[in-house]
């Protein structure tokens, strides 16, 4: 729409085209233009406000009739809205609707609202947080609108007490006095920035501040930026060298997303390690996600995410991407032997050797050990390298024999991505060198004594065939594009579901793939395509409908933000920003283009899965038709309750998992069974969890069990933004309806708490599986 | 408190029309739509017409389209009905109500069409 | 044009006695269901706004439920004052429809 996420917009009744605005503090619909009565903002907890009247839509619940008007900012009333779809929804899950010509709030009200000028939901640019730097606030986000002298102030101001532009923390200035400088992106690297040419790179360095790793995140993100990555000794050195600097402060290191190693928040590969001995990588139960670094020796430490501390924030000076296109099919030949894959070759050694032996005979076969470059790489080395035994570790050719620890491909090729297990890299404190494997099931790495004998892969340049109209194998007919064994194809037509075909997405590289295929939508309106995943009962349960009308159970999921917001729809993937993303829309009303998709072979088997007949281990439950088994830590039972991270770790220790479901039945039969356990209340932490920055918002599960099926309740948090993990409720002969999963005997409810909580908890493994000792 | 006072009614013959009115009090008239709702004798209700609260939008019942006009003055905070061409079928008593629930409604006034 | 079918058209009932009068629309109106009570000689006194709101005043024994096509208007415990006829009216979209009333007569 052109418009700037937090440009002030018209709000349009879909129904009617007419907009709204207020009057005497009522609202009603008028014709439709940008004159400032009818002018509204997102602001600070979901709340709208009015430029023109200074004031905010609410809903005063506690009168007999819900009256929808306009309310001071600090008023008592219900003043959050949030969206669903296009429907706008406040307290008690009353939705804005028009009712001749008058603004009314009403349950189930169908009404849709866009911003004008758009086709955008009010939320599509949702408000985003603008943190603070100096003042006396320490970093806490501006509080909009603020109240100075009479006047709601709705962004920042510029006076000539202030060095820059400046907000109030809090709702009244005038009262509490707290303020800050504002954190806003801004071209270039001139008022809160450093430049530093050499790294190309410009640093915010936010000294008196204290936010959690994600408000830090958030605020680097905000800016247009992203937390601290280092990637260099020499960086290093002038971090350590840098005069002001805060002694502590986050950087984007961390291994927030679920069963995946260390990362840098800016997905720059992270080959160059400095870690402190004393808090390293790979800590036992009680370690952390996040990364710290220490100024003065320069080390970076594992601490916990919910502390506060300082942060640097950094932007490169200009943002030239990149584009590799990786993901092009490209016919390849290689000698017998060898697998052709776009471009390369690579041979699987099936005998065991140290690296330097296995380095030594790819060499003898004029090729290296295998160098990995991008998710296609991987996906070579997951689907088509492993056939049989996927548990084997196998040799690559990244190695480090520097202090600090830097490592490097041995062919010689830049690192331009690291794709490290959980805990990992940990690497031996002063101890080289260093190798790294992966393991095949999911090709993720990990460090290595060099010594240590396993199988390897070397790689190799292929000769590359010409190119023909349509990729080979693939059907002759324009457009069709070959992926693995796949060919896909892109229909351009906007129709309602299930009309041209049923794409099945079932592995984060397929998903990488298509998203590939996606990206030239970006610049234009934003379009949706259709994929098959339906939810067909109208239960809450998302399946993938197939061919002959076969349900396919979800493998991989990737779910936008807030998603999947309601039962019975349909799935499309939204390009732009967020491309590829989830999101349910209506079967036959939406429109979206098309993927389809034709196998050169059979749809393979689903994976096999545990038997509900098979038995648990000693000291741990089932319960009829569960495929996993249950070991609840209740406070009866342990010594102190832990936080989500704690929790999980504590559960891994056991070579288990915080609890996960795949159905809705599932949970239900689940706290059927927890109820017996014990008596009274109890909240339990669960493996959902949204923490890891990748995700947007979207929620996983730590087991890495994709989620398929409504979870979270719609229940309005004013801090759901942090609330970043999510625990059950278990209790017996409740009072009041839970918002989900509710059945004759129990009421079962399901919330997102902070991760820093300390709550009981349930670890689960499956049926079959020996757990740790 | 809110108050809806119709007036006009009366006895008028076929084809002959009359002018409705409602005055309102105890609200904020100009933010509000209002409605004519109408009873036969002895029978259920009738939705009549809406106008929007600053007169922008009109909408007729099918029975009505054409012959009835509804009108506000905000400044006068009355609602009219102009109804023209009567008919013994448009015998009724008249209700205004305020939109957009229904909350609240006049007294109503009694139209009587015969020759 | 949206039907409204309410029944029972007549019923009796003594004080004290639960009521249940329905309301179904001949397509989906949302909440957009208004129930009425009006006595001889009076104009209609609205109860129930949304399907499910009670109106300012209204005693809370009056209760509405119901989203779609299908709605209820149910009495808790009858009162004498509550003998009179009840309407459903649908205003999701003109014209405005009424279904064609309820009496509620003592037994």
């Known amino acids: 729409s052109g418009r700037a996420a937090n440009d002030p917009f018209t709000i349009v009744h879909g129904n009617t085209g007419k907009c709204i605005k207020p009057v005497y503090g009522w609202i009603v619909a008028d014709d439709c233009d940008e004159t400032e009565d009818k002018l509204w903002k997102w602001v600070s907890q979901h709340r709208l406000f009015h430029l023109h009247s200074q004031k905010c839509l609410g809903l005063d619940i506690t009168k007999s009739v819900n009256e929808l008007r306009m309310f001071s900012c600090d008023s008592s009333a219900m003043l959050w809205w949030k969206c669903e779809h296009h429907s706008l929804y406040g307290a008690a899950r009353y939705r804005l609707a028009l009712k001749d010509g008058h603004g009314t709030a009403i349950s189930n009200a169908s009404d849709v609202w866009k911003k004008g000028g758009s086709e955008e939901s009010l939320c599509d640019q949702p408000y985003h947080e603008i943190y603070t730097r100096d003042g006396n606030s320490y970093g806490r986000p501006c509080e909009f609108p603020f109240l100075i002298d009479g006047t709601w102030h709705h962004d920042c101001i510029l006076d000539e007490d202030h060095s820059g532009p400046w907000c109030a923390t809090t709702l009244n200035y005038e009262y509490d006095r707290k303020w800050g400088i504002c954190l806003k992106p801004e071209n270039g690297c001139e008022d809160n920035w450093e430049k530093n040419e050499q790294f190309g790179s410009c640093y915010q360095f936010n000294t008196q501040t204290a936010l959690s790793w994600k408000e830090a995140y958030v605020s680097c993100q905000n800016q247009g930026a992203d937390l601290l990555s280092i990637n260099s000794a020499a960086e290093l050195t002038y971090l350590k060298e840098k005069e002001g600097i805060a002694k502590i402060f986050w950087i984007g290191l961390n291994q927030l997303y679920s069963a995946r190693g260390w990362e840098w928040s800016d997905h720059k590969p992270l080959n160059f390690l400095n870690w402190d001995p004393d808090r390293p990588s790979a800590p036992t139960i009680g370690g952390s996600s996040c990364a710290r670094m220490d100024a003065e020796s320069g080390l970076w430490q594992s601490f916990s995410c919910e502390a506060q501390l300082p942060y640097v924030c950094r932007k490169p000076l200009n943002n030239t991407v990149e584009l590799t296109d990786v993901w092009t099919y490209s016919d390849t030949r290689c000698d017998a032997g060898w697998l052709p894959n776009n471009g390369f070759c690579y041979l699987l050694v099936n005998e065991s050797n140290s690296w330097d032996k296995a380095h030594a005979k790819c060499k003898a076969f004029s090729s290296d050990l295998i160098s990995i470059h991008s998710l296609a790489d991987v996906e070579v080395v997951v689907t088509k390298l492993h056939n049989e035994d996927i548990k084997e570790e196998v040799w690559i050719g990244l190695k480090n024999i520097n202090i600090p620890t830097l490592f490097q491909w041995s062919d010689g090729t830049e690192v331009t991505l690291t794709y490290w297990d959980e805990n990992e890299p940990n690497v031996p404190y002063n101890k080289t060198p260093n190798c790294v494997s992966y393991l095949g099931e999911l090709g993720q790495w990990k460090v290595q004594s060099c010594e240590e004998k396993l199988k390897y892969v070397c790689k190799r340049k292929g000769e590359k065939l010409n190119d023909a109209s349509s990729d080979k194998m693939c059907p002759p007919d324009e457009g069709w594009k070959r992926h693995g064994e796949t060919c896909y194809k892109i229909y351009e037509d906007e129709v309602p579901f299930g009309t041209n075909c049923n794409l099945t997405i079932t592995s984060r590289f397929e998903q990488e793939y298509l998203n590939d295929l996606m990206k030239k939508y970006d610049k234009s309106l934003r379009k949706y395509f259709w994929t098959g995943l339906r939810d067909v009962d109208s239960c809450g349960e998302y399946n993938w409908a197939t061919v002959g009308g076969r349900r396919r159970a979800v493998t991989f999921s990737n779910w936008n933000f807030l998603e999947p917001a309601s039962p019975g729809g349909c799935v499309a993937m939204s390009t732009g920003k967020s491309v590829g993303k989830w999101e349910v829309k209506d079967c036959r009303s939406f429109k979206a283009l098309s993927i389809c998709k034709k196998m050169s072979g059979p749809l393979g088997p689903e994976e096999a899965s545990p038997k509900p007949d098979d038995p648990c281990p000693e000291g741990w439950q089932s319960f009829p038709a569960s495929l996993s088994c249950y070991k609840v830590f209740h406070a009866e039972r342990i010594v102190r309750k832990r936080n989500w991270e704690e929790a999980e770790r504590f559960c891994q220790a056991l070579g288990a998992h915080l609890s996960s479901f795949s159905h809705v039945d599932e949970i239900k039969e689940f706290l059927h069974f927890l109820t017996d356990q014990f008596s009274g209340q109890h909240w339990l932490w669960i493996g959902l969890n949204k923490r890891s920055p990748d995700l947007q918002g979207s929620w996983q599960w730590s087991d890495r069990t994709p989620v398929s099926t409504i979870i979270m309740p719609n229940e309005f948090q004013q801090d759901y933004d942090i609330r970043d993990c999510a625990a059950v409720k278990v209790f017996h002969r409740p009072w009041r309806r839970g918002w989900h999963f509710y059945d004759d005997r129990e009421f079962i409810y399901l919330r997102p708490f902070a991760c820093d909580t300390k709550l009981e908890w349930v670890c689960q493994i499956p049926k079959g599986r020996t757990p740790k000792t | 408190q809110v108050q809806l006072v119709e007036s006009g009614g009366g006895v008028v013959q076929p084809g002959r029309s009359l002018r409705l009115s409602c005055a309102a009090s105890g609200f904020i008239f100009s933010i509000y739509g209002m409605h004519w709702v109408r009873q036969a004798p002895g029978k259920g209700l009738e939705w009549v017409a809406v106008?929007?609260?600053?007169?922008?939008?009109?909408y007729y019942a099918d029975s009505v389209k054409g012959r009835f006009t509804i009108s506000r003055d905000n400044s006068k905070n009355t609602l009219y009905l102009q109804m023209n061409s009567l008919r013994a079928e448009d015998t009724a008593v008249y209700y205004c109500a305020r939109a957009p629930h229904f909350d609240y409604w006049g007294q109503g006034t009694l139209v009587t069409v015969s020759s | 044009d949206i039907q409204m079918t309410q029944s029972p058209s007549s019923l009796s009932a003594s004080v004290g006695d639960r009521v249940t009068i329905t309301c179904r629309a001949s397509q989906g109106i949302s909440s957009w269901l208004a129930w009425y009570q009006q006595k001889p000689e009076k104009a209609p006194k609205s109860l129930i706004y949304?399907?499910?709101s009670l109106q300012s005043g209204v005693p809370s024994r009056f209760s509405g439920s119901g989203s779609g096509t299908d709605f209820t208007l149910t009495i808790s415990s009858l009162q004498p004052e509550d003998f009179a006829t009840y309407y459903c009216?649908?205003?999701?979209?003109?014209?405005?429809?009424f279904g064609q009333g309820t009496k509620l007569e003592i037994k």
């Open positions: 949304a399907a499910s």
């Open positions: 009216q649908q205003y999701n979209s003109y014209p405005y429809t």
């Open positions: 106008i929007w609260y600053d007169g922008s939008n009109k």
